[in-house]
């Protein structure tokens, strides 16, 4: 009679996490009596997946009814598989022995692999805000997938960057991976709205990529434009003066004006005027009461935005060019005096 | 294909710990033993122990209470420490990978580190 | 522990000769499926060990085939059908049936 054979006929097999995985294995004979074992690996180190005879195994079922008197299919069936079960299986046959079965003949081995889904790529940027220009980095990360081949593409507003970095860790074997990105990012003044996206792909996810995104908002600082005008005379010993702060984001920003070097009135910006780009405008002004003043005045317009170095505008307020009030007996006013409400906003 | 490269200090110091590293390279962990060997100067060769690719370690009983082989996937690599030493533990030591096969268990050891020189003198 | 024991010591062989090398274990390599659990190593000088016979008759790969294994339960032999010089170095046995392995003391071959 032909000698028993054990057919393990895949090679291999890929399940998804969380899915049960298949081992077919069957003999060619009944004879010689003993049980079957199914081992994940070879040799001294091997470990006992399923043992026909005896022990639990709470996530391991036969395919067919083992009890049967002909059976000759010990395929197993196992459970809410995970990364960790990845290995090579094999069915292996014993001969009834005294005191111990001994193993007799072995199946050629099914190799398992565990695909797992990455998890959302989080993206993020910069600990400080940047100006447009310099350039800054972006790190994306993913973890928990399996195996390890995965792609990664980094776009900003929909247009695919070319300067980054990409490390799948770690480089030997592991039961799931982790991939880690820095992209480098040129800013522009124009990027207030824009979005850098991370685009992963991988085996499991169907050609459907997961991404994550960073909003450029959250790192740009666009600094203001100043510029300092003044208005046709109000009346006959006012001058309106205005500061129009242009182009900044985000908005936090305060405004000091300066009167010959000395401070006047502070005020922080609240109702601004937002641009298409994202960015915002602010305008405060001041009426001037030319007659307090025998000199020119010297103006300045200072402005703190996001808590950087001051930037200034100033303007010189030519006082000869207004006639003087004659014979007034009375205590001139106060030399600035804001128009109401103070400051004023456009 | 598959390379072995072994680590560590050339010099232990009498009743200190030896800790060597083992980093395999061009190949996976998976399926195959891993072994330690050493070889005293003009001597021969002693199996010291080894591990599988599930973490699963056998010791020569002559050394077992001394010794501890752990693996590292993640790193591709597997390490030897071993306690209390003399100068009896100045030799060569190797890495080295055994080849298992169901039906068949260990088939050869197959590749071999270059060796590294340890000597053990205060 | 199986004892593993070599003979001889050393051999002298002259290149283009055959030779033959002894290995004897303490208990019978040979086990219930057929195989023989003994290797071969050849350790030439300075260098590692390589791996040359295994499982008692199969040759490891790239080995040339002047190197041949035989024997079967406690004897085993190593022949090299014609010597050449960069055959020279200590081959020793080693039985990989149970832990620990355990080698031979070594044979060491020389060109006379």
């Known amino acids: 009679e032909e000698e028993l054979q054990v057919i393990q006929p895949d090679k291999s097999i890929s399940v998804a996490a969380g899915e049960s995985a298949t081992l077919h294995c069957t003999v060619t004979s009944l004879i010689p009596v003993g049980p079957i074992q199914w081992f994940r690996g070879a040799g001294p180190g091997r470990e006992l997946i399923y043992n026909q005879k005896e022990g639990h195994f709470p996530r391991v079922t036969t395919v067919s009814d083992l009890t049967k008197r002909n059976n000759m299919d010990f395929s197993i069936r196992i459970s809410n598989i995970t990364p960790a079960d990845a290995g090579t299986y094999y069915c292996v046959k014993f001969r009834k022995g005294s005191p111990d079965h001994v193993e007799f003949k072995s199946g050629a081995g099914t190799e398992l692999s565990v695909r797992a889904k990455p998890s959302a790529p989080v993206v993020s940027g910069p600990a400080a805000r940047a100006t447009p220009q310099h350039t800054v980095s972006f790190t994306c990360e993913s973890h928990g997938f399996s195996p390890r081949d995965i792609t990664l593409k980094w776009f900003k507003n929909g247009n695919e960057l070319s300067d980054f970095q990409t490390n799948v860790d770690p480089a030997g074997d592991s039961v799931s991976y982790s991939i880690h990105s820095t992209a480098k990012v040129v800013l522009t003044r124009e990027d207030v709205h824009s979005q850098v996206i991370c685009e992963v792909a991988h085996v499991t996810l169907q050609g459907d990529p997961l991404r994550g995104t960073a909003n450029l908002s959250e790192t740009i600082r666009v600094p203001p434009t100043l510029e300092v005008t003044q208005q046709p005379v109000r009346a006959e010993n006012q001058v309106n003066v205005t500061c129009q702060v242009r182009k900044f984001y985000p908005q936090r920003l305060q405004l000091t004006w300066l009167e010959n070097g000395n401070v006047s009135r502070t005020e922080t910006a609240s109702t601004l005027t937002e641009n298409k780009d994202g960015t915002y405008n602010w305008m405060s002004w001041l009426l001037v009461n030319v007659s307090a003043h025998r000199d020119d005045v010297k103006l300045t317009c200072q402005v703190e935005h996001d808590g950087q170095p001051a930037v200034s505008k100033s303007h010189d307020l030519k006082v000869s060019a207004h006639p003087k009030e004659q014979g007034s007996n009375t205590a001139p006013g106060p030399a600035l005096a804001s128009a109401a409400p103070l400051g004023g906003s456009g | 294909q598959v390379q072995l490269q072994e680590s560590g200090p050339g010099l232990v110091r009498p009743s200190e710990t030896l800790s060597l590293t083992c980093t395999v390279s061009?190949?996976?962990?998976?399926?195959?033993?891993w072994s330690w060997i050493r070889q005293p100067p003009g001597k021969g060769l002693e199996w010291m122990g080894f591990i599988y690719d599930n973490g699963r370690t056998f010791y020569n009983p002559s050394l077992k209470s001394r010794v501890t082989i752990s693996l590292d996937m993640s790193m591709n690599q597997f390490s030897l420490k071993m306690t209390s030493v003399t100068a009896a533990d100045t030799a060569v030591y190797y890495c080295a990978r055994v080849r298992a096969y169901s039906g068949i268990g260990l088939d050869g050891t197959d590749v071999w580190g270059q060796g590294t020189t340890v000597t053990v003198s205060s | 522990d199986i004892v593993m024991t070599q003979s001889p010591l050393s051999l002298p062989v002259t290149p283009g000769e055959p030779a033959s090398i002894s290995c004897k274990s303490s208990q019978s390599l040979l086990y219930s499926n057929a195989y023989n659990y003994l290797d071969w190593y050849l350790q030439r000088p300075g260098q590692s060990p390589q791996l040359l016979i295994y499982?008692?008759?199969n040759r490891a790969s790239g080995v040339p085939d002047r190197f041949s294994g035989s024997g079967s339960g406690t004897d085993f032999t190593l022949k090299i059908s014609r010597v050449e010089a960069e055959d020279v170095g200590v081959y020793y046995c080693m039985q990989a049936l149970q832990t620990p392995l355990t080698f031979g003391g070594g044979t060491k071959v020389e060109i006379k």
């Open positions: 499982l008692g008759s």
């Open positions: 061009g190949g996976s962990i998976r399926n195959y033993y």
